[in-house]
């Protein structure tokens, strides 16, 4: 079969070969398309509801005056010349329509290094078939799943038209000291071969650096944090930012029922003050960020205390 | 809101001659054919005539070709059939119908226009 | 020309039954066939397009359905506004040709 594409709303016209040029003409056309169940017969004196879809025209060449997704197809002609000799013409139609330019909706202006972000969405509508959206940064493709890039795909179908609306959501990861603008831009490839990408503008959104948040220490007096029964321990919690934030105190991982202070004074120790403490600083820029932890315990007499305290983990990193 | 309003019906003798009208709004008029449908008092439905969307094609039954002729102006939104040597058997309600090709079939009416051919 | 050919020409029913009319065409139709209701003095309203499909603002209980040339009309359960009668329609080929009518009544 000849393979045939044709656009959506277009007329089309298939030669019925070895057709006389005029009537009378012994020639019949078979259509199996999505308006048809099995075969749909046209003859050159059929006329009627058929017409406003496909309709054999006096040279014997079956005209659609506007074609439709429903006239994706195969198209058959069997003619007989004048000689009785049969000739018979077989063609494949597929339609096509270009949407169109596809555009960046709810598009960032600001997009923050190190964490991932919304960048945009592109929206493309009215194609058929479907085709695909693809993003480029300054130019070249990003693959979705690699280096902190994904991407979220919607695909709808017009109920009337049978058109098709893509939406793809681009989120990505900025790395740290990269590019301070890069640019974003989206394109649409057509499912049907032989027709060009279509083109977003460009975005350039702006990439911010968070400045890095200096550690929160924790130093506790005596160092080491072990100490005789009725012994006095100070935590001090020390934080270089400006303004001071605000210090919470955390014993086994529960917050201490005390007002915000730098600084914790456990006087006569007893054994249930034996536990591991950090403190929480809370930015109002930055949100909390927890110092390291320190394990406080008590020496009894002839015990030989630690040289120095047995602290936990890390302890950095921001709180949930 | 599709609307479709028939009028030019009436009485007249058998023999003569009626132009029935059909005023369209609420549609974009020149997308769709246009059928006349009648319906004899007590009977079923009859189909009488289509138009193409361009009016280049028209299409009757043989019990009215040659007699009756449907026409259209789309720059006025509307249907017209011209009814000639009229019978006593042409008396009926003419009903104004969106379509009569495979696309569509009739999906709307107009409220119908009674002709009454008789001495 | 093709005939279609509409069964029950009348029928009693009572509200809340499930009603059935057949149109059975001479010959091949494709899916080309519409329904239609009509109350007296009214011009018809369609009421399934396309053999099967429900047209706008028609309540679910009608329904179409097709087997070869042999289509059907269902009310799943009969409402007071549905007396009525009810027509088919070929629109395959000219001409174009309704069944004879389905006149249903109440019981």
């Known amino acids: 079969a000849q393979n045939i594409t044709a656009r959506i709303g277009e007329p089309l016209v298939l030669k019925c070969k070895g057709a006389p040029k005029k009537p009378p003409q012994r020639l019949e056309w078979k259509l199996n398309t999505g308006r048809t169940e099995a075969w749909k017969v046209l003859s050159p004196q059929g006329g009627g509801p058929w017409d406003s879809v496909a309709r054999v025209l006096p040279n014997g060449s079956l005209f659609l005056p506007a074609v439709g997704i429903q006239d994706e197809g195969i198209f058959r002609c069997q003619a007989m010349n004048r000689n009785g000799k049969e000739t018979k013409s077989n063609y494949r139609v597929r339609v096509y329509q270009i949407p169109g330019k596809p555009e960046i909706v709810d598009s960032a202006s600001e997009l923050t290094a190190g964490v991932p972000n919304k960048v945009g969405t592109c929206v493309s509508e009215g194609s058929y078939p479907a085709g695909t959206l693809s993003w480029h940064l300054d130019g070249k493709p990003l693959v979705p799943n690699e280096k902190g890039v994904s991407v979220k795909e919607q695909t709808r179908r017009h109920p009337e038209t049978g058109l098709f609306t893509l939406q793809s959501e681009l989120m990505v990861t900025p790395a740290r000291g990269g590019d301070p603008r890069p640019t974003f831009s989206c394109s649409f490839s057509p499912g049907l071969p032989r027709h060009r990408a279509l083109r977003t503008a460009p975005i350039q959104p702006r990439v911010w650096e968070p400045v890095p948040l200096e550690e929160v220490q924790l130093v506790v007096e005596p160092e080491g944090g072990a100490v005789a029964p009725g012994g006095t321990v100070t935590l001090t919690c020390e934080v270089p930012a400006q303004p001071s934030p605000q210090i919470h105190w955390m014993k086994d991982g529960v917050p201490l029922p005390l007002p915000p202070s730098p600084v914790l004074i456990l006087p006569e120790i007893g054994p249930q003050d034996q536990g591991t403490y950090s403190c929480v600083a809370t930015h109002s820029s930055h949100g909390p960020q927890e110092s390291r932890a320190v394990s406080i315990s008590i020496i009894e007499p002839g015990e030989e205390g630690p040289t120095a305290g047995s602290v936990g983990g890390s302890g950095l990193g921001t709180l949930a | 809101e599709v609307q479709l309003v028939e009028s030019g019906g009436g009485l007249v003798q058998p023999g003569g001659s009626l132009r029935l009208s059909c005023a369209a709004s609420g549609f974009t008029f020149n997308n769709y054919w246009m059928t006349w449908v009648r319906q004899a008092p007590g009977k079923g439905l009859e189909w009488v005539a289509s138009i193409d969307n361009s009016g280049d094609n028209t299409y009757y039954p043989d019990s009215v070709k040659d007699r009756f002729t449907i026409s259209r102006d789309n720059a006025k939104n509307s249907l017209y059939l011209q009814m000639n040597s009229l019978r006593a058997e042409d008396t009926a309600v003419y009903y104004c119908?969106?379509?009569?090709?495979?696309?569509?079939?009739?999906?709307?009416w107009g409220q119908g226009t009674l002709v009454t051919v008789s001495s | 020309d093709i005939q279609m050919t509409q069964s029950p020409s009348s029928l009693s029913a009572s509200v809340g039954d499930r009603v059935t009319i057949t149109c059975r065409a001479s010959q091949d139709v494709g899916i080309y066939v519409n329904w239609f209701q009509q109350k007296p003095g009214k011009a018809p309203r369609r009421l399934i397009y396309r053999a099967t499909n429900l047209a706008d603002g028609v309540p679910s209980r009608f329904s179409g359905s097709r087997s070869g040339t042999d289509f059907t009309l269902t009310i799943s359960s009969l409402q007071p506004e549905d007396f009525a009668t009810y027509y088919c329609l070929q629109f395959d080929a000219h001409p174009l040709t309704f069944g004879g009518g389905t006149k249903v009544e109440i019981k």
């Open positions: 119908a969106r379509g009569g090709d495979i696309t569509t079939g009739f999906d709307y």
